[in-house]
């Protein structure tokens, strides 16, 4: 299945964080979502063939990339309290 690391993370405001997602073998598309109690599930961005194909309405502090082996990373710089959330990754063909 899809593997995300780390499972849990505690950071202080102003720090940066990098989350990793390994898709199902053979899947070329990886999408990232942010889930919060207040806003529900919000789309961050989608990568396909190592390229960002779509992006949601998030500030430039949120960025990502996809490596040649399809693994993806998302990065949040200068963390704010409102960034506390569950970050989900999904993969597809």
């Amino acid at each position: 299945g899809v593997t995300q690391t780390p499972r849990y993370l505690i950071k202080t405001r102003g720090q940066q964080v990098t989350l990793s997602c390994s898709p199902i073998s053979g899947h070329r598309s990886v999408s990232w979502y942010q889930q919060t109690p207040g806003q529900g599930l919000q789309f961050l961005f989608e990568y396909f063939s190592e390229t960002q194909r779509n992006k949601g309405n998030f500030p430039g502090r949120f960025s990502g990339r996809q490596f040649s082996n399809s693994r993806s990373e998302m990065n949040v710089s200068t963390l704010e309290l409102g960034d506390s959330a569950l970050y989900l990754c999904a993969s597809s063909l």
Epitope: E50, T51, Q52, G60, R65, F67, S68, N69
Partner: antibody, heavy 118, light 106 residues
Framework: EVQLQQSGPVLVKPGASVRMSCKAS????????IHWVKQSHGRSLEWVGY????????GYNQKFKAKATLTVDKSSSTAYMDLRSLTSEDSAVYYC???????????WGQGTTLTVSS | EIVLTQSPAITAASLGQKVTITCSAS?????MHWYQQKSGTSPKPWIY???KLASGVPARFSGSGSGTSYSLTISSMEAEDAAIYYC?????????FGAGTKLELK
């Protein structure tokens, strides 16, 4: 330090073929796609295509599909571009560039100058 | 194919002058990137993802825009800024560059 070292200038006759190389160092070669870009004399940049060094998958600008073939040698961390049926229109500087994994080129080679002349 | 139109094609600025280069896309794009190229050298990443400065780029440079209209601005022209600037976008599966803007020192 990330570096993309390209092969030297080439002079060939019309109708010939040529291979140019791009040797990567300073990072894991199979992590990032390598793209090729053409710059004709005094003109803008044209995207030729890319290769995924991890699995060999390629993508081409339709304009160059019959002209260019992209390959890699993982053991030497080197990407290659073969150009065939050369004409004077193919005379240009060709750059290899590393794709950042999202939407732009974060490192470029120094370029290979190709001159096609009889 | 998304066509990128840069304007002006050539411009000259005096030291300390504010400079703005624009890049217009034929269809909406998510991101625009800018490269600087000086004579006889390879392009360098200059501004990426619309407004992020690449490593080593002076703070007098900035980028902005959305949809089909993007710009690169130099708040105060310096001699070392004289170069050609190219915009670039990637709309899968085709990547395109603008024709370039040549910035000269007046």
């Amino acid at each position: 330090e990330v570096q993309l070292q390209q092969s030297g200038p080439v002079l060939v006759k019309p109708g010939a073929s040529v291979r140019m190389s791009c040797k990567a160092s300073g990072y894991t070669f199979t992590d990032y796609n390598i793209h090729w870009v053409k710059q004709s004399h005094g003109r803008s940049l044209e995207w030729v295509g890319y290769i995924n060094p991890y699995n060999g998958r390629t993508g081409y600008n339709q304009k160059f599909k019959a002209k260019a073939t992209l390959t890699v040698d993982k053991s030497s961390s080197t990407a290659y571009m073969d150009l065939r049926s050369l004409t004077s229109e193919d005379s240009a500087v060709y750059y290899c560039a590393r794709w950042d994994g999202s939407s732009y080129f974060d490192y470029w080679g120094q370029g290979t100058t190709l001159t096609v002349s009889s | 194919e998304i066509v990128l139109t840069q304007s002006p094609a050539i411009t000259a600025a005096s030291l300390g002058q504010k400079v703005t280069i624009t890049c217009s896309a034929s269809s909406s794009v998510s991101y625009m990137h800018w490269y600087q190229q000086k004579s006889g050298t390879s392009p360098k990443p200059w501004i990426y993802e619309i407004s992020k400065l690449a490593s080593g780029v002076p703070a007098r440079f900035s980028g902005s825009g959305s949809g089909t209209s993007y710009s690169l601005t130099i708040s105060s022209m310096e001699a070392e800024d004289a170069a050609i600037y190219y915009c670039q976008q990637w709309n899968y599966p085709l990547l395109t560059f603008g024709a370039g803007t040549k910035l000269e020192l007046k």
